[in-house]
C-alpha cells in the first residue's frame, strides 16, 4: 500500500537526525514498466543507498556538521539502463543535535576603550563559534560576562550582547570610568549554546583585557564671535579634537543655510570665514563630525554653538514718511492722540535698540508751541496745553528726533484737527430681508450691499464707518467690507456655507466709527439692521478627517495585521465605502466598512518606506460622490538581509610567486537600516579549512581584510568563503566568497599567453 | 559458453513477411535484454528495437514501429523478430545480441541472410 | 535522435603505424555511454571497446579509446595485419540506439 514509506517516483524531502543509527528504510520507490530497477546518484557520501527494487535508505549515523543537507537524484531505470523516469530531487535534511560545544576563538582577548564612550557601543567583540545548526538552539549562543575586575562599589562598568559577544560599556561606565582612577580591566566571559537556557548546554571561557584611554572628543564651550568684525578672515574661533590621529574632520549645517560661514581644517580646528551680521542670523548651531579614512563616523558628532554679539550698526527707522493721527477739536487735556512707533534693528532689550523720541519742531505754531507733547521712552502723543480748534489751524505737523545711543533719526508726523464726532451711522434700511443660497456659493462672492450714512465732517473718523456682524454667524462664514468713499458696505463669502450645520441665519449688522463719540451721545437702533441668510441642500462628497493619515509598523508583521485606519464622514449623512486605490505592491486591504487597513502580503522596507497609497470614500447611495485622500505606511526596519559583499570583487589576483605574505580589503553591506554608527560586521573564515593558509581581522564595522598565512600557493584560482555576522537581532550571516588568483605576472599584471584570455583578473595585490 | 543461434536464411517475395529465431544458451535468458540490428549489403549497423524477456515489453526504433514484432518463448529461451510487407530494400543480414545492462551488445548471433526478390 | 559520424570513412595505413578514428556526437553523452565494436568481412560485429576506454575480453592493449563530451577517439598505437577490419562506434544514452556509418581500416 502506498503511504507514508512508500509510493511513485516524485521529489520528496526527508528529515533525519544526525548522530542517529538507522533503524528503518527511508522510503519505498515504486516501479512503473518499462522502469525495472532504480539509480541513486549526487551527495551520497556511501551513506545512502537504493536497492534495485527501489527501497532507499541508509547505512550509518548521518553527521550534520560534514552536511547539512544530502542533494539526491533517483532515477528509474528499464532493462537496457535508460533513464525512464526523472531523475527527481530526493533532498535529504540532516537535523541538529547538540554535539558540538562553543569554543571561543582566541583564548585571550585585548581590546581598549575611551572613557565617557557612548554606553552600548561596541568597542570589542569576543567571537565563539559552534558547529551545531544556529537555526537551532544547538547553536545559538549566549554570552556573559562572568566576572569584571576590579569590581567597584558592586558596579558593572562594562556589559556584553548576550547575542553578539559585543561588549560594550554600561551608562555607569560610560559616567566613571576615569583612566586616572583604574587604567585596566580583567573580564572573564562565557559562551554557552542552547542559547544559554539549558542545564545541558555546553560552554567555554576566555579573558579579556580592557586598557581605559582618555577621551578628548568634546563639544567645546559656546563661542561668542561679535558682528561686523574688521579682522583678516578666517578667525580661528574654537576646536575639536578626536582622540587618535588621521581623523578627517568635517562641519554640518543642519539649517541647510544658503550661506555657512564656518570651517574646520583637517588639525580640528574651527574657523569663522567672513563677517557675520546680527540683524541676518543671531546664533548658528552646527556639528562638527570625524571620521575614519572609509568615510564611517568615528562617534556622535559634536554640538558647536556660536552666538552673534550685537554692536550698535542700526539707526532707529520710521514706521513710515508721514505718520497721520486725527484729534477732535474738543479733545481734553492728556488724551492720546496716537503712538509713534520707531524701529531698531540692533538686538532688543539693549542699549543699541533702546529709543528715546522727542519733538524738536511743531508747525504752525499757532495758537502757540508746544501744544503737544511726546513720552520720551514709549513714542505716544498727548495734547499738552488745550483744545483745538478746527477753523483757526485744521492741521499741524511735527518733526520727532528718534535716538538709540549711537544714532538719530527724524520722522514725520501729520496732526488733522477734525470735527467733534457727534452723529451717530444711520442705516438706511433696518431690515434687508430674506436671502437664498447654495450651499457651494463661491467663497468671494458679494452677496448683499448695505447702506449707512453718517453726517459728521466727511472723510475723517467721525464719518468713517465700519460695519460688524454682531450676531448670527458665529463660524465667521461672511465678512463686510466698506467702500471708503461711499461708506457702502459689501457682504462676502469668507468660508463655505453649510446647510448642514446653519441652514438658516439671522444676522445683525452694526455700524460704527473708528473714532468715539462724543460725552453723551450713543449709538442707537438705527445703527443695527438684519437679514436672513437661507442656505440650500448641495450633495457634497465624502469629507476625509485628514489630508494624510500616517501609520507605522515594523516591516515583518504578520499577515492580516491592522496596520492603520482611515475616518471620512459624509456631510448628508450617508454610509460610506472605502477602497485603496495605487496599492502597487498588493501589500493591503481596507475594510469597506470600517476604514480599517490590514497587511495581506509580507511587507518590506528595503522595498521601499514609506508605502504610499489613496484611500478612497464613497457615498453608499445618492450620487456616489467620492473623495481622495492618503495613506502612508512608515515600515521600521527589523534585520531581514543577511550580510553581502558590498561590490564585485571578481578580479582579485596575488603575482605568483609571493615574495611576502600580502593582504586585501574588501567590504561588506546589507539592506537593512543602519542608525548613525553604521554597520557592525564581524568576519571570519567561512570554514575551518580555510585557515592553514588564510586570515581574515576586521578593519572597522564594514572593513575586513584578507591576509595570505604563507607563501606557498599553486598557479591558480583560490576560492575563500568568508562568514560575515551583522550583529543584528536576530543576527544574520552571510557566507561570501571571494575569488583569489595567484597568477604569473608581466609589469604588475596578470600574464596569459594569447588565447587564454578569459576572466583576467584586474586588481592585482 | 555464452552463445546466440540464429535460424538459416530466407527468400522472399516483396510484401510478404519473415519471421526469424534466435537461441540463447549459457547464460540466464530472463536476464538481459535481446536487440535486433540489421545491416544492408555494403552498409553499417542500425538497431532495430528490443525485448524484455523478463516482462515481455519490447521498444521498437520509430522507422520499423509498424512492420515489425518482437516475441520470446521463455520455455525454450529463444527470442523472434518477424518482419512484415517486405520490401527490396529490406534485403540484409538480421543479427541478434544480446544487450548488458547500462552497458553495450557483449555477445552477436551468426546474423541471418534475408533476401527481398521478386 | 543521437546521429554519430565517423571520420574518416577510409583510413590506409601500413602494418607498424598509428591509427586515431574518430567517432562525433551530436548532443554530448556520458562518456560511458559510447561503445566501439570491430567487423570483419562475413563476420557478426564484435564487443571491442567499451563505455570510452574499457578494452573487451581478448582485446590487445595496443587498442586504446578517449574522449568525453561529443568527441571520441580509437586509438591503434602500431597497427598489426589482424587489426585491419571496420570500427563501428554506438550510443547507449538514449533510444533509439545508433551507430556510426564505420570507418575501413585497410592496409596501404
Known amino acids: 500500500q502506498e503511504g507514508k514509506f512508500s509510493g511513485p517516483l516524485k521529489p520528496m524531502t526527508f528529515s533525519i537526525y544526525e548522530g542517529q543509527e538507522p533503524s528503518q528504510i527511508i522510503f519505498q520507490f515504486k516501479a512503473n514498466p518499462p522502469a525495472v530497477t532504480f539509480e541513486l546518484t549526487g551527495e551520497t557520501d556511501n551513506i545512502f543507498v537504493i536497492e534495485r527494487e527501489g527501497l532507499l535508505y541508509y547505512n550509518r549515523a548521518l553527521d550534520r556538521e560534514t552536511r547539512s543537507t544530502h542533494n539526491l537524484q533517483v532515477a528509474a531505470l528499464d532493462a537496457n539502463g535508460i533513464i525512464v523516469e526523472g531523475p527527481v530531487p530526493i533532498t535529504i535534511k540532516v537535523k541538529d543535535i547538540n554535539d558540538n560545544r562553543p569554543t571561543f576563538l582566541q583564548s585571550k582577548y585585548e581590546g581598549s576603550v575611551r572613557q565617557n564612550s557612548r554606553p552600548g557601543k561596541p568597542f570589542l567583540y569576543v567571537n565563539a563559534t559552534d558547529l551545531d545548526d544556529p537555526a537551532t538552539p544547538n547553536g545559538q549562543l549566549y554570552y556573559q560576562i562572568v566576572i569584571q575586575l576590579p569590581m567597584i562599589n558592586n558596579v558593572m562598568y562594562f556589559q556584553i550582547n548576550n547575542k553578539t559577544g559585543a561588549i560594550s560599556l554600561t551608562r555607569e561606565g560610560s559616567q566613571e570610568l576615569n583612566p586616572a582612577k583604574n587604567p585596566s580591566y580583567n573580564l572573564v566571559i562565557s559562551v554557552k549554546d542552547m542559547g544559554g537556557q539549558s542545564e545541558n548546554s555546553f560552554s567555554d571561557t576566555t579573558s579579556v583585557d580592557i586598557i581605559v584611554t582618555e577621551n578628548i572628543w568634546k563639544a567645546p564651550k559656546p563661542v561668542e564671535m561679535v558682528e561686523n568684525s574688521t579682522d583678516p578672515h578666517p578667525i580661528k574661533i574654537t576646536q575639536v579634537r578626536w582622540n587618535d590621529p588621521g581623523a578627517q574632520y568635517s562641519l554640518v549645517d543642519k539649517e541647510k543655510l544658503p550661506r555657512f560661514p564656518f570651517s574646520i581644517d583637517q588639525e580640528g580646528d574651527i574657523y569663522v570665514t567672513q563677517p557675520l551680521d546680527r540683524e541676518e542670523k543671531d546664533a548658528y548651531v552646527f556639528y562638527a563630525v570625524a571620521k575614519d579614512e572609509y568615510g564611517k563616523p568615528l562617534s556622535y558628532p559634536l554640538e558647536i554653538h556660536v552666538k552673534v554679539k550685537d554692536i550698535n550698526d542700526n539707526p532707529p527707522t520710521c514706521p513710515s514718511p508721514v505718520t497721520v493721527f486725527e484729534v477732535q477739536e474738543n479733545e481734553r487735556l492728556g488724551n492720546s492722540i496716537g503712538t509713534l512707533t520707531a524701529h531698531d534693528r540692533d538686538e532688543e532689550n539693549t542699549a543699541n535698540s533702546f529709543l528715546n523720541y522727542r519733538i524738536v519742531e511743531q508747525t504752525p505754531k499757532l495758537p502757540m508751541d508746544g501744544l503737544f507733547l511726546i513720552q520720551t521712552y514709549a513714542g505716544m502723543l498727548q495734547l499738552a496745553k488745550q483744545s483745538l480748534k478746527k477753523q483757526d489751524t485744521p492741521q499741524y505737523n511735527l518733526t520727532i528726533e528718534v535716538s538709540d545711543k549711537d544714532f538719530k533719526t527724524l520722522c514725520f508726523v501729520q496732526i488733522n484737527v477734525i470735527d467733534i464726532n457727534d452723529q451717530i451711522p444711520i442705516f438706511e434700511k433696518s431690515d434687508y430681508g430674506n436671502l437664498t443660497l447654495a450651499e457651494d456659493t463661491n467663497i468671494g462672492s458679494t452677496i448683499l450691499t448695505i447702506q449707512a450714512t453718517d453726517a459728521d465732517e466727511p472723510f475723517t473718523g467721525s464719518s468713517k464707518i465700519l460695519y460688524h456682524i454682531i450676531k448670527g454667524d458665529s463660524e465667521g462664514r461672511l465678512g463686510v467690507d466698506t467702500d471708503p468713499h461711499t461708506n457702502t458696505g459689501y457682504v462676502i463669502i469668507k468660508k463655505p456655507l453649510d446647510f448642514e450645520t446653519a441652514a438658516v441665519s439671522n444676522i445683525v449688522f452694526k455700524a460704527e466709527n473708528p473714532e468715539p463719540l462724543v460725552f453723551g451721545v450713543k449709538y442707537n437702533a438705527s445703527s443695527f439692521a438684519k437679514f436672513t441668510l437661507i442656505v440650500t441642500d448641495v450633495n457634497e462628497a465624502p469629507q476625509f478627517s485628514q489630508h494624510v493619515f500616517q501609520a507605522k509598523v515594523s516591516e515583518d508583521v504578520a499577515i492580516g495585521t491592522k496596520v492603520g485606519n482611515v475616518t471620512a464622514k459624509d456631510p448628508e449623512g450617508l454610509d460610506i465605502s472605502y477602497s485603496l486605490r495605487g496599492d502597487t505592491r498588493g501589500w493591503l486591504k481596507i475594510d469597506h466598512v470600517t476604514g480599517e487597513i490590514f497587511s495581506v502580503a509580507p511587507l518590506d522596507r528595503e522595498a521601499g518606506s514609506p508605502y504610499r497609497v489613496q484611500v478612497v470614500a464613497t457615498e453608499v447611495g445618492g450620487s456616489s460622490l467620492s473623495s481622495v485622500s492618503e495613506f502612508h505606511l512608515i515600515l521600521m526596519d527589523v534585520n531581514d538581509n543577511p550580510p553581502r559583499l558590498a561590490k564585485d570583487y571578481t578580479g582579485l589576483f596575488f603575482c605568483h610567486p609571493l615574495s611576502a605574505p600580502g593582504s586585501l580589503i574588501f567590504e561588506a553591506t546589507d539592506d537593512d537600516q543602519h542608525l548613525f554608527r553604521g554597520p557592525h560586521f564581524t568576519f571570519s573564515l567561512g570554514s575551518g579549512s580555510l585557515q592553514n593558509d588564510w586570515e581574515v581581522s576586521k578593519i572597522n564595522g564594514t572593513h575586513a581584510r584578507l591576509s595570505t598565512r604563507h607563501t606557498e600557493f599553486e598557479e591558480r584560482e583560490y576560492v575563500v568563503l568568508i562568514r560575515i555576522n551583522d550583529g543584528g537581532r536576530p543576527p544574520l550571516e552571510g557566507i561570501v566568497s571571494l575569488p583569489v588568483t595567484f597568477c604569473s605576472c608581466v609589469e604588475g599584471s596578470c600574464f596569459r599567453p594569447a588565447g587564454h584570455q578569459t576572466g583576467i583578473p584586474t586588481v592585482g595585490m | 559458453q555464452v552463445q546466440l543461434v540464429q535460424s538459416g536464411a530466407e527468400v522472399k517475395k516483396p510484401g510478404a513477411s519473415v519471421k526469424v529465431s534466435c537461441k540463447a544458451s549459457?547464460?540466464?535468458?530472463?536476464?538481459?535484454?535481446m536487440h535486433w540490428v540489421r545491416q544492408a549489403p555494403g552498409q553499417g549497423l542500425e538497431w532495430m528495437g528490443y525485448?524484455?524477456?523478463?516482462?515481455?515489453?519490447?521498444y521498437y526504433n520509430q522507422k520499423f514501429k509498424d512492420r515489425v514484432t518482437m516475441t520470446r518463448d521463455t520455455s525454450i529461451s529463444t527470442a523472434y523478430m518477424e518482419l512484415s510487407r517486405l520490401r527490396s530494400d529490406d534485403t540484409a543480414v538480421y543479427y541478434c545480441?544480446?544487450?548488458?545492462?547500462?552497458?553495450?551488445?557483449?555477445?552477436w548471433g551468426q546474423g541471418t541472410t534475408v533476401t527481398v526478390s521478386s | 535522435e543521437i546521429v554519430l559520424t565517423q571520420s574518416p570513412g577510409t583510413l590506409s595505413l601500413s602494418p607498424g603505424e598509428r591509427a586515431t578514428l574518430s567517432c562525433s556526437v551530436s548532443s554530448s553523452i556520458s562518456s560511458s555511454n559510447l561503445h566501439w565494436y570491430q567487423q570483419k568481412p562475413g563476420q557478426s560485429p564484435r564487443p571491442w571497446i567499451y563505455g570510452t576506454s574499457n578494452l573487451a575480453s581478448g582485446v590487445p592493449d595496443r587498442f586504446s579509446g578517449s574522449g568525453s563530451g561529443t568527441s571520441y577517439t580509437l586509438t591503434i598505437s602500431r597497427l598489426e595485419p589482424e587489426d585491419f577490419a571496420v570500427y563501428y562506434c554506438q550510443q547507449w544514452t538514449s533510444y533509439p540506439f545508433t551507430f556510426g556509418q564505420g570507418t575501413k581500416l585497410e592496409i596501404k
Open positions: 545480441a544480446r544487450g548488458f545492462f547500462k552497458g553495450y551488445f557483449d555477445v
Open positions: 525485448i524484455d524477456p523478463k516482462s515481455d515489453y519490447n
Open positions: 549459457g547464460y540466464t535468458f530472463t536476464s538481459y535484454t
